[in-house]
């Protein structure tokens, strides 16, 4: 004989459990229906009547099947340094994430509690590790043969152009300046003395970290004063 289908509320088998989307009500000692997302339990079940559900009010929500007496309040409106990536609905909480150029310095279960502006690397320093949603930019001094002449949270150190004839040698914060004879590097139309990577990917993606120390690991020519340790602005 097929097992008889039980309708809520019903008493579970001794030692048994309630089915999916049901809960055991201690007072009624019965298996009762949960309320779906977007609703809450308006009236709890009894031995003879099932749970009565009702829709969440404005600015409140339930995300899961539940038997809570009241819906949860949606979080406060997003701050000026945030963007609302998920609106408050009856079924989900508002989610605030940091706007471009910012990262989450203090996260919460969903979204971000506190955003902070991404560090900008000053001239002579480039991005060693780009910022993510939850981590700040890491700057590094531009290693020999490379430079950055910008204050930026995205620009990496780029190699100096190689000249037929050098007018001014490059340094960590300035590209080499070539004389009127064309430099030995492909130039983009209209570009002046900027290195053009062969690879089609953006110059700002996956910057590779420079070696932390040069002695013993270069094919490098010794010249000039030691680099400063820090390379960011506004810290």
């Amino acid at each position: 004989l097929p097992a008889q289908v039980a309708f809520t509320p019903y008493a579970p088998e001794p030692g048994g459990t309630c089915r999916l989307r049901e809960y055991y009500d201690q007072t009624a000692q019965m298996c009762c229906s949960k309320c779906p997302p977007g609703q809450h339990a308006k009236v709890f079940c009894t031995k003879t009547s099932d749970t009565v559900c009702d829709s969440c009010e404005d600015s409140t929500y339930t995300q899961l099947w539940n038997w809570v007496p009241e819906c949860l309040s949606c979080g406060s409106r997003c701050s000026s340094d945030q963007v609302e990536t998920q609106a408050c609905t009856r079924e989900q909480n508002r989610i605030c994430t940091c706007r471009p150029g910012w990262y989450c310095a203090l996260s919460k279960q969903e979204g971000c509690r506190l955003c902070a502006q991404l560090r900008k690397c000053r001239p002579g320093f480039g991005v060693a590790r780009p910022g993510t949603e939850t981590s700040d930019v890491v700057c590094k001094p531009c290693a020999p043969g490379t430079f950055s002449n910008t204050t930026s949270s995205t620009d990496i150190c780029r190699p100096h152009q190689i000249c037929h004839v050098v007018a001014i040698p490059g340094n960590a914060s300035m590209d080499a300046v070539c004389t009127s004879t064309s430099p030995t590097r492909s130039m983009a139309p209209g570009a002046v003395h900027l290195p053009q990577p062969v690879s089609t990917r953006s110059q700002h993606t996956q910057p590779t970290p420079a070696p932390s120390t040069a002695p013993g690991t270069s094919f490098l020519l010794p010249v000039g004063p030691s680099p400063p340790a820090e390379g960011s602005t506004g810290d």
Partner: antibody, heavy 127, light 109 residues
Framework: QSLEESGGGLVKPEGSLTLTCAVS?????????ICWARQAPGKGLEWIAC????????AYYASWAKGRLSISKASSTTVTLQMTSLTAADTATYFC????????????????????WGPGTLVTVSS | IEMTQTPSSVSAAVGGTVTINCQSS??????LAWYQQKPGQPPKLLIY???YLTSGVPSRFSGSRSGTEFTLTISDLECDDAATYYC????????????FGGGTEVVVK
């Protein structure tokens, strides 16, 4: 701008030879370093040494070349490579090449991208 | 620093693509150059800092880096590309007796 090597030729084992690299079209100044490399017949390239084109006279060598080969700036237009105790293994075409300099850090330097080369001079060590 | 270049020789038809690899024994960041050498001539600098093309070099040549592995790719192969190609670590160290790779001969059919 160009580089030209001279001084190659036939030399006996244990003999000595001085190669010269003459630059033209640019000045030997702190904007450039001059380096030597060599290539044995049918073989690959081997770096030897580099010297600052400016007034510092700073030079550095491949470990195998230290003591037996000596690079120096002879004038504002020439760099020499003195070679002693030559053996058959030193038989090769010797190239001088130019590296662009960099205003930078004492504990760093400049990457050696050889963007200008001379045609080379052949050194044959044989009895 | 040792530079291990593979393969030692490669053959491809006109219009084809050739890939040459170079492995560095140490982390050299992006300090790597690629040279082209034809018989009886000095080497010619093609690419520096792993992926930057020097002027006059066709964009059919490209370079890339992944950690200590570097790649030179020649696409739309032409007869004039027949040569030996060398990678070079642009880092100096006292242990670097040869900063060049062993070379790869490219034969164009």
């Amino acid at each position: 701008q160009s580089l030209e090597e001279s001084g190659g030729g036939l030399v006996k084992p244990e003999g000595s030879l001085t190669l010269t690299c003459a630059v033209s079209g640019f000045d030997l100044n702190s904007y450039y370093w001059i380096c030597w490399a060599r290539q044995a017949p049918g073989k690959g390239l081997e770096w030897i040494a580099c010297i600052d084109g400016g007034s510092t006279g700073s030079a550095y060598y491949a470990s195998w070349a230290k003591g037996r080969l000596s690079i120096s700036k002879a004038s504002s237009t020439t760099v020499t490579l003195q070679m002693t105790s030559l053996t058959a293994a030193d038989t090769a075409t010797y190239f001088c090449a130019r590296v662009q300099s960099y205003v930078g850090y004492a504990n760093y330097g400049y990457p050696n991208y050889f963007n200008l080369w001379g045609p080379g001079t052949l050194v044959t060590v044989s009895s | 620093i040792e530079m291990t270049q593979t393969p030692s020789s490669v053959s491809a038809a006109v219009g084809g693509t050739v890939t040459i690899n170079c492995q560095s024994s140490e982390d050299i960041d992006s300090y790597l150059a690629w040279y082209q050498q034809k018989p009886g001539q000095p080497p010619k600098l093609l690419i520096y800092h792993a992926s930057y093309l020097t002027s006059g070099v066709p964009s059919r040549f490209s370079g890339s880096r992944s950690g200590t592995e570097f790649t030179l790719t020649i696409s739309d192969l032409e007869c004039d590309d027949a040569a030996t190609y060398y990678c070079q670590s642009a880092y100096y160290s006292s242990s670097a007796d040869n900063t060049f790779g062993g070379g790869t001969e490219v034969v164009v059919k």
